[in-house]
Every structure is written in structure tokens, then in C-alpha cells.
């Protein structure tokens, strides 16, 4: 009854500092409520980037001030992280928790290395 989570190894953010990736999980049970958390790991320190709980069949709802948005389809979650800068380059881990009904199950992906390159400033025009 293992809970496996898959996510891409590498993603490149676009010029506007937006990165998207899919987090897919193999559910050992029939969960009706799922929580998805994006964690950033840097130098063995782990911090929460964003989190959302959703009912199966419904949309993910992140907090209004979250830098994440997402959609769900079955056991697949499409995550988008916005407002990234070069200093935010790092390993972003997808954690999936089956919250209800019990028993609780948890799965963690191996992480997606997100590379962010700050855009070059536009040259002054005479």
C-alpha cells in the first residue's frame, strides 16, 4: 500500500518567472480529500512554498496571497509557481497527503529542480 509521487526532474522557468510542472500520485486508497504541498529544499533546510487542500473532482484552492496556482485531474495535479527570481532556483518537492477518509497516507516526490534566470534589462534606446 505504498503511496508513490512522481514529478519531473528539471523545469526551466519562463522569462516572466513562472514555472509549471505536474505532480502525479498513485493512491493506495479511495481518498475524497487530498492535500498538496510544495516544499523548497536548500542546503538541507526545507520550507513550505504553498499548500492546497481539495476534494476529489473539485479544483485546488490556494490562499489568495499564494504564489502557486493549480488544477487537478484524477490523481494528477498541475502546479504553477509564479514570481520566481534567479535566487529562487532550487529543488521543489511535491508532497501529497490523503487526508480523508482515514487511514492517512503520505507520499513525497523526488523533487523538481527549477532553474530561474533573471531577464536581461532592456538596453537604453537613444
Amino acid at each position: 500500500k505504498a503511496m508513490h509521487v512522481a514529478q519531473p526532474a528539471v523545469v526551466l522557468a519562463n522569462s516572466r518567472g513562472t514555472a509549471s510542472f505536474v505532480c502525479e500520485y498513485a493512491s493506495p486508497g479511495k481518498a475524497t480529500e487530498v492535500r498538496v504541498t510544495v516544499l523548497r529544499q536548500a542546503d538541507s533546510q526545507v520550507t513550505e512554498v504553498c499548500a492546497a487542500t481539495y476534494m476529489m473532482g473539485n479544483e485546488l484552492t490556494f490562499l489568495d496571497d499564494s504564489i502557486c496556482t493549480g488544477t487537478s485531474s484524477g490523481n494528477q495535479v498541475n502546479l504553477t509557481i509564479q514570481g520566481l527570481r534567479a535566487m529562487d532556483t532550487g529543488l521543489y518537492i511535491c508532497k501529497v497527503e490523503l487526508m480523508y477518509p482515514p487511514p492517512y497516507y503520505m507520499g513525497i516526490g523526488n523533487g523538481t529542480q527549477i532553474y530561474v534566470i533573471d531577464p536581461e534589462p532592456c538596453p537604453d534606446s537613444d
Epitope: 500500500k1 505504498a2 503511496m3 508513490h4 493506495p28 480529500e33 492535500r35 504541498t37 516544499l39 526545507v46 520550507t47 513550505e48 499548500a51 487542500t53 518537492i93 508532497k95 497527503e97 487526508m99 480523508y100 482515514p102 487511514p103 492517512y104 497516507y105 503520505m106 507520499g107 513525497i108
Partner: antibody
Framework: QVQLVESGGGVVQPGRSLRLSCAAS????????MHWVRQAPGKGLEWVAV????????DYADSVKGRITISRDNSKNTLYLQMNSLRAEDTAVYYC????????????WGQGTLVTVSS | EIVLTQSPGTLSLSPGERATLSCRAS???????LAWYQQKPGQAPRLLIY???SRATGIPDRFSGSGSGTDFTLTISRLEPEDFAVYYC?????????FGPGTKVDIK
């Protein structure tokens, strides 16, 4: 720094009730699952209960189901354990513990509060 | 429920020696969701290892964890006087979250 401080333990007669509290500080309380773990005198560790994030989802060990209720007040950064119909076998040190971000292992523990059930 | 068994029950060693503690699960622990704790008399437990092999913050590198599936090991490469304590393993892949009965490491 992360701090967890339990209170509410004491001596109570069998069949009576007791409420334990755990005051948390030094972290964003609502982002973590919070647990109670107990240890009977001279025995090993036993997980008792967990309450997740916003407090809607909870889970219990079979040994306490129906007699113990876990709750939290995120506005007060406080975790609770309501213990009813207490038995002698509930005698233990009760620890409040924070679940880790990478899973429900216990990365910070309180100092524990002793509950003694005796007539 | 996943039942964890620890061996040996007691390990008698001298400072400077290597300690090898075993934790065996009744069924596979998904994705190595296993933790190790140290507990000294009168104190709360302290997290040493999570994810079977990741050291917790501030834990000396003489502590290492390994294993997967049903067999896990905690190794203390060179015992320091402060390492004599009881060690517990715990699985956290699914509820109920269970502990092993503990291994006591005492001074020979």
C-alpha cells in the same frame, strides 16, 4: 526557536476526565500536523493522536478511540487532548510533538506532562 | 498496522566502539518513511534520522541510517559517552504511526 510546553497533567481517578494543553511558539502553527505521543512508566513510546493543519482531520490509535479527542486552536497556537473515561493503563507521560514538513515524524517535542490514573 | 521490531533489546558497548541497531517492519515501509529517535532518562525523545537516512538538524555525523523496505539500521560509528541511551524507530508512511519497542545502548 520552536517551543512546545504541555500542561494539565496530574492525578485523576479512574473514569474521570482531564484536558491537556500544549502551547506552541516559534513556528507557523497552522502549517504543521500536531501529535500526542505517550510513554507509560518504564515503557516505550506510543503514538496517541494527530490533528492536521486546519483541525478538520484527525486520527487516533485504536487504544484510545472513543475516549480521547484531539483539537487545536490555530488563533492561540494551542493543541489540546481531552481525555475521558480514564483507565489505569492511561497512566503515562504525555508529549506534544510537531510533525515534520517532510512527513509525520516528530521533529520537536515538549517536555511532557505526567498523567496518573489511580483511585 | 505496521509492527516494528527492534534488535537487540540491549546493546552493551564501550565508548569508541561502533553500535549497530536494527529495526524490522512487519510489512514494507513505503518510500523509506522511517525515523530514529534517541531518549535519555527523564528527557523527551530527540529526532536523529528521518527518511531512513537523512540526519536531523544538529545531529552529529557519527549517526547514520540506512535500509529500505522492511529492514533498517541505525549506526553510531564511534560511541561517545553522551550516546548511551534508548533508541526508537518509527514508521510514518501511513497511520497509525508506530514505534518499535526500543534498543537500550548501555556502557559495558
Amino acid at each position: 526557536q520552536v517551543q512546545l510546553v504541555e500542561s494539565g497533567g496530574g492525578v485523576v481517578q479512574p473514569g474521570r476526565s482531564l484536558r491537556l494543553s500544549c502551547a506552541a511558539s516559534g513556528f507557523t502553527f497552522s502549517s504543521y500536523g500536531m501529535h500526542w505521543v505517550r510513554q507509560a512508566p518504564g515503557k516505550g513510546l506510543e503514538w496517541v493522536a494527530v490533528i492536521w493543519y486546519d483541525g478538520r482531520n484527525k486520527d487516533y490509535a485504536d487504544s484510545v478511540k472513543g475516549r480521547i479527542t484531539i483539537s487545536r486552536d490555530n488563533s492561540k497556537n494551542t493543541l489540546y487532548l481531552q481525555m475521558n473515561s480514564l483507565r489505569a493503563e492511561d497512566t503515562a507521560v504525555y508529549y506534544c510533538a510537531r510533525g515534520g514538513l517532510l512527513g509525520p515524524y516528530f521533529d520537536y517535542w515538549g517536555q511532557g506532562t505526567l498523567v496518573t490514573v489511580s483511585s | 498496522e505496521i509492527v516494528l521490531t527492534q534488535s537487540p533489546g540491549t546493546l552493551s558497548l564501550s565508548p569508541g566502539e561502533r553500535a549497530t541497531l536494527s529495526c524490522r517492519a512487519s510489512q514494507s515501509v513505503s518510500s523509506s518513511y522511517l525515523a530514529w529517535y534517541q531518549q535519555k532518562p527523564g528527557q523527551a525523545p530527540r529526532l536523529l534520522i528521518y527518511g531512513a537516512s537523512s540526519r536531523a538538524t544538529g545531529i552529529p555525523d557519527r549517526f547514520s541510517g540506512s535500509g529500505s523496505g522492511t529492514d533498517f539500521t541505525l549506526t553510531i560509528s564511534r560511541l561517545e559517552p553522551e550516546d548511551f541511551a534508548v533508541y526508537y524507530c518509527q514508521q510514518y508512511g501511513s497511520s497509525p504511526f508506530t514505534f518499535g519497542p526500543g534498543t537500550k545502548v548501555d556502557i559495558k
